[in-house]
Interface confidence: low
């Protein structure tokens, strides 16, 4: 289920207090919910407002809510209140944003928190043209696809290690689908990957998840056959016809913010090495020690645990407030081109422990639709047109959106235009140490 | 089995406001697909007016996107055209239909006449 | 908006005979993705349109197998290849690509 994608969208910083509060002089408070801010419909959330040992209130207030959304009395020691949400529906889905009043008055607005809402549409197709079989070196294009009028697709690749980016294709008239172009493949790109579809009007109401589709890379050096456990989807239906836009989305109107692995990643590296570290300083110690002392190790009963280290060992923090106690790091971008009309926002949320990574693609209809340069995809005719006449009778709403269980890493990209055409589809060939291959386009880690 | 039904006044007079309904049968609006309003001139000419999704999204001719409104009732599997300041070139039969592959179900039409 | 030109305007022939109505569009409705947003709708007398193909050439779910479509670009055909008296009406091409999506004017098939 869906809980598991548990990626917080990044908390916008560039959007201002709400003016009905006087905004006072205090710290903001931070704002993150709990399983994640992506919740399947039905299932329950708890958003999180932490402030100061001194707040005596807390509110949240929703975008478009009537204000305020809830109030809360602090839970001990009163840094921390609880909003609790049993069941998840589309009225509850959208922009947070937390307060806290002290003695001395009310705080700033916390960042928002989006709360995003999974399985409010059917699921969308997700094919790889020509083939989920790919060659090291070469091209395949992910295609997702609705059936019906969408605007906003996301594409999901568990565990990945680097942000995927994506070129919009032209929006057609009367369907919809997004491509995803990967090129040249490298064994990175191998994998699970999902999408959603969605609306521009909701941003934050998702379809239920494709079925995985699992690209192969063979030529890499790892085991090119599928798992057992997952099928390689390769079908694509007859939902590929293209989609009239929706309305106009307003320019200034719900941001989305796209979240990227650098921090994760980074912080990984830096646990990795310092446990490497460890093991080398225990590895170091064990060669010194006396015969008595190995023999007293031998003798400990079964049962006895080892004893435990001064720093308190590579422990995971359950709480996400914690997190934010510590670096927040948070990548931005605003790439903004006059000629494309294209700005894209990376930050990463403080708050995740298993990120996912997903790439966003929204059209905005904010002049008038040129074609688009887009990358020669070896689409095939037939791959595209396979007629299946009993596609509404086949045809699953699924109730569960069943994800995948595994951590996955989150990317969004927002387009304004039909004319973004950068060299975006090539990805990094891992950030593991290495710089980004695209400085204009991929995030320079910030720390805040 | 999927149908769909148009109803209307039958007659409106120049400037007022024409509100047609289309309910739907055998599928719920909101599962899927969009719902769209097309109109047929005397002399046959086909003209799409516009649609809403199944997840209320809407989309519309440009030629009428000053003065049409389409919604829905999903408690009842219905959805609505509304055509403001109407004149007597909006006289046509209006037809609801479906959209997938392609315009896959069509009501029957209702014949709507913009007459003082 | 795109124009769809048919021709002919109407088309006189026997039962049994080969019939093929061409559809120009002003402009390409080729998709980036290959596709090409073409479809063939009939409407027979006091009836609503029903559709036979799309995309081309793709038939609908029950249109019999006498009815294709072909063509690319800008340029496509409907053949019928034996007209039986239920196919009588008249035969509109739509593009599906450009907004607004546009019909054809419509090509009248009639006995001879």
């Known amino acids: 289920m869906i809980p598991t994608f548990t990626a917080l969208l990044c908390l916008g910083l560039s959007l201002g207090p709400r003016t009905h509060m006087q905004a006072g002089p205090l710290p903001k408070p931070t704002l993150w919910a709990e399983p994640g801010s992506v919740i399947s419909w039905g299932n329950s959330v708890t958003i999180w407002c932490q402030g100061t040992l001194e707040a005596r209130e807390y509110r949240l207030d929703k975008e478009e809510s009537p204000a305020p959304w809830d109030r809360q009395n602090p839970l001990e020691p009163k840094n921390k209140a609880r909003f609790s949400i049993p069941s998840m529906t589309e009225d509850y889905a959208g922009r947070y944003r937390c307060y806290y009043r002290s003695p001395v008055g009310w705080s700033q607005p916390s960042d928002p928190l989006e709360l995003v809402m999974t399985g409010a549409y059917s699921k969308p197709t997700l094919s790889a043209l020509p083939s989920p079989l790919v060659t090291s070196g070469k091209s395949v294009t992910l295609l997702c696809q609705s059936r019906s009028p969408m605007d906003t697709f996301l594409l999901i690749k568990e565990r990945a290690a680097h942000p995927l980016l994506h070129l919009r294709s032209e929006h057609g008239a009367q369907q919809h689908q997004a491509e995803f172009p990967m090129s040249p493949v490298t064994s990175v790109h191998g994998g699970t990957y999902r999408c959603f579809s969605s609306h521009g009007f909701s941003h934050y109401l998702l379809s239920h998840p494709s079925d995985p589709l699992e690209l192969i890379v063979s030529g890499s050096l790892e085991d090119p056959r599928p798992s057992p456990t997952r099928s390689v989807s390769t079908a694509a239906g007859p939902e590929d016809q293209p989609l009239m836009p929706t309305g106009s989305v307003p320019h200034s109107g719900l941001r989305r913010h796209w979240e990227v692995l650098i921090g994760v990643l980074v912080v990984s590296i830096l646990l990795l090495s310092l446990l490497l570290f460890l093991l080398l300083q225990h590895w170091r110690q064990g060669k010194h020690r006396t015969l008595a002392q190995r023999q007293a190790d031998f003798q400990r009963p079964p049962g006895a645990a080892e004893p435990e280290p001064k720093d308190g060992g590579l422990q995971r923090r359950s709480s996400p407030a914690a997190d934010v106690q510590g670096e927040n790091f948070c990548a931005a971008v605003k790439n903004t081109q006059p000629e494309d009309g294209v700005e894209m926002d990376t930050r990463q949320s403080p708050h995740d422990e298993d990120p996912q990574a997903v790439t966003y693609a929204k059209v905005k209809h904010s002049r008038p639709r040129r074609e688009m340069a887009s990358p020669p995809s070896p689409l095939s005719g037939e791959f595209l047109d396979t007629k299946d006449r009993q596609a509404e009778e086949d045809r699953q709403m699924d109730t569960e959106a069943a994800a995948s269980e595994a951590p996955q890493d989150v990317t969004y990209a927002q387009l304004h235009s039909f004319t973004l055409r950068q060299k975006a589809t090539e990805p990094p060939p891992s950030q593991e140490g290495a710089s980004p291959a695209e400085p204009s386009v991929y995030a320079t880690l910030a720390i805040h | 089995d999927v149908q769909l039904q148009e109803s209307g006044p039958g007659l409106v007079k120049p400037s007022q406001s024409l509100s047609l309904t289309c309910t739907v049968t055998?599928?719920?609006?909101?599962?899927?697909?969009?719902w769209n309003w097309i109109r047929q001139f005397p002399g046959n000419k086909l003209e799409w007016m516009g649609y809403?999704?199944?997840?209320?999204?809407?989309s519309y001719n440009p030629s009428l996107k000053s003065r049409i409104s389409i919604t829905r009732d999903t408690s009842k599997n219905q959805f609505f055209l509304q055509l403001n300041s109407v004149t007597t070139e909006d006289t046509a039969t209006y037809y609801c239909?479906?959209?997938?592959?392609?315009?896959?179900?069509w009501g029957l039409g209702t014949t709507l006449t913009v007459s003082s | 908006d795109v124009l769809m030109t048919q021709t002919p305007l109407s088309l006189p022939v026997s039962l049994g005979d080969q019939a093929s109505i061409s559809c120009r569009s002003s402009?390409?409705?080729?998709?980036?993705?290959?596709?090409?947003?073409l479809e063939w709708y009939l409407q027979k007398p006091g009836q609503s349109p029903k559709l036979l193909i799309y995309?081309?050439?793709n038939r609908f779910s029950g249109v019999p197998d006498r009815f294709s479509g072909s063509g690319s670009g800008t340029d496509f055909t409907l053949k019928i290849s034996r007209v039986e008296a239920e196919d009588l009406g008249v035969y509109y091409c739509?593009?599906?690509?450009?907004?607004?999506?546009?019909f054809g004017g419509g090509t009248k098939l009639e006995i001879k």
């Open positions: 239909a479906r959209l997938h592959y392609g315009y896959d179900y």
């Open positions: 055998g599928y719920s609006i909101t599962s899927d697909y969009a």
């Open positions: 809403i999704s199944y997840s209320g999204g809407t």
């Open positions: 739509f593009q599906g690509l450009h907004v607004p999506p546009t």
């Open positions: 402009q390409s409705i080729v998709h980036s993705n290959g596709n090409t947003y």
């Open positions: 995309k081309v050439s």
